[in-house]
């Protein structure tokens, strides 16, 4: 029977800069029941506080609700593990909410095959930002990424959509059923999970030169232009 091993705070995430949650890994339990507590103070504060909510984030977590979350302050936190034989402390973790945002996935993903009479057919993809994110305040810039693949294919084709909430793709295999997903990330922060997949059947008469793709209208000043694979690669890395 031993004191508990050193715990580690391994992750903190915020869905929207308004709340956040941190998780820790327990060390060894020393063969005894072990209690964990997370204490914190904000930079410039003298007083230590204890985690306000150990429930919401699941086991070994601390959730900070709206009233406990300050965007412009660094939180300094540590976890204490205690059993009958003694205590051990994690290293201090410094957390700035601005840099730990991981949004929920985008919503309302809609995919449609468009076949205008006067132009080449294309796949039109549209989505909405996650509901918890308030883009109107200007605190957030969300960037989006789309991935798609034929149902039976192993490899995903990935497209960066910038800040747009819609995107057009030309190069697709006719007659195939495609899976399409979208995810988002703030300018500082982490990619969301991928949205649930939306399926779309590409008609057999969807014809296009496979070496040509259409990139986002915003990136090309609103014009619809065809560019080659080589140009596309250059465009994404300039």
């Amino acid at each position: 029977q031993l004191p508990p091993g050193k715990p580690e705070i391994f992750k903190c995430r915020s869905p929207n800069k308004e709340t956040f949650t941190c998780w820790w890994r327990p060390g060894t339990d020393g063969g005894l029941p072990t209690n964990y507590s997370l204490t914190y103070h904000r930079e410039g504060e003298t007083l230590m506080h204890e985690c306000p909510d150990y429930i919401t984030g699941g086991p070994n977590s601390c959730h900070f609700g709206k009233q406990y979350t300050s965007m412009w302050r660094t939180y300094i936190m540590m976890v204490n593990a205690t059993n009958q034989m003694g205590s051990s402390f994690s290293d201090e973790l410094y957390v700035d909410v601005t840099y730990i945002v991981q949004p929920d996935p985008p919503l309302e993903l809609a995919v449609e095959v468009k076949q205008p009479e006067d132009r080449k057919p294309y796949l039109w993809i549209k989505w909405s930002p996650p509901t918890l994110i308030d883009l109107k305040t200007g605190w957030f810039t969300l960037l989006y990424e789309i991935r798609l693949k034929p149902e039976k294919a192993a490899e995903w084709e990935i497209h960066f959509a910038g800040q747009q909430t819609e995107f057009k793709i030309l190069s697709l295999h006719p007659g195939q059923k495609y899976l399409v997903q979208v995810r988002c990330k703030p300018d500082h922060g982490y990619w969301s999970a991928w949205s649930p997949a939306t399926f779309i059947q590409i008609p057999s008469d969807f014809t296009m030169n496979d070496e040509q793709k259409l990139i986002s209208e915003e990136d090309l000043g609103g014009e619809q232009k065809l560019i080659s694979e080589e140009d596309l690669h250059h465009h994404h890395h300039h």
Partner: antibody, heavy 118, light 107 residues
């Protein structure tokens, strides 16, 4: 509606003991640090003790250190103050108060009177 | 320990008056100061926290200002229900301390 109700006050001789309780309702009790504050008759407010959400941080005023013990039972939504070796100067109304760490003592009970007298 | 000194201790005023109460801290406490109102036989009621934030449900005639060592509570137009005792409290460091109080009486 948030309610904090203190009980356990009364008349006790110097050197005696009392245990105060504070029953909370209408709040997620386990999410808040809790405090005891007292007020001697006709005097100002004096902070006595505080206890954090899972009791890992406990603090006392110097005037009660070693004599008073604060504790909580989150399962029962209850806060306690065990008062030993009571003195005349401990005579006061004792309030329990919720501490919203983002703000201050935002909810208070109605108080319970403790009289220490021979 | 951080001492809080309130001034004045007593204040006579009339309905409609503008009232200012000052609280000095013996050392800097940033903005970690709260103001409470207490009426006879009742528990204190939170008015202002972090020096200037109005507690929900408190009338806007109450306002707080200051940081560091000097803080003020202002009642812009005194109402009959505002006659009470007012306390400041520092939440910067233990032991948490209260000012001695300011009793606002009817002139």
């Amino acid at each position: 509606e948030v309610q904090l109700v203190e009980s356990g006050g009364g008349l006790v001789k110097p050197g005696g003991s009392l245990r105060l309780s504070c029953a909370a309702s209408g709040i997620t009790f386990s999410s808040y640090s809790m405090n005891w504050v007292r007020q001697a008759p006709g005097k100002g407010l004096e902070w006595v003790s505080s206890i954090s959400t899972r009791s890992s941080l406990i603090h006392y005023a110097d005037s009660v250190k070693g004599r008073f013990t604060i504790s909580r039972d989150n399962a029962k939504n209850s806060l306690y103050l065990q008062m030993n070796s009571l003195r005349d100067e401990d005579t006061a109304v004792y309030y329990c108060a919720r501490w919203d760490a983002a703000a201050a003592f935002d909810y208070w009970g109605q108080g319970t009177l403790v009289i220490v007298s021979s | 320990d951080i001492q809080l000194t309130q001034s004045p201790s007593f204040l006579s005023a009339s309905v409609g008056d503008r009232v200012t109460i000052t609280c000095w801290a013996s050392q800097g406490i940033s903005s970690y100061l709260a103001w409470y109102q207490q009426k006879p036989g009742k528990a204190p009621k939170l008015l202002i926290y972090v020096a200037s934030t109005l507690q929900s449900g408190v009338p806007s005639r109450f306002s707080g200002s200051g940081s560091g060592t000097e803080f003020t509570l202002t009642i812009s137009s005194l109402q009959p229900e505002d006659f009470a005792t007012y306390f400041c409290q520092q939440l910067n460091s233990y032991p948490l301390t209260f000012g001695g109080g300011t009793k606002v009486e009817i002139k």
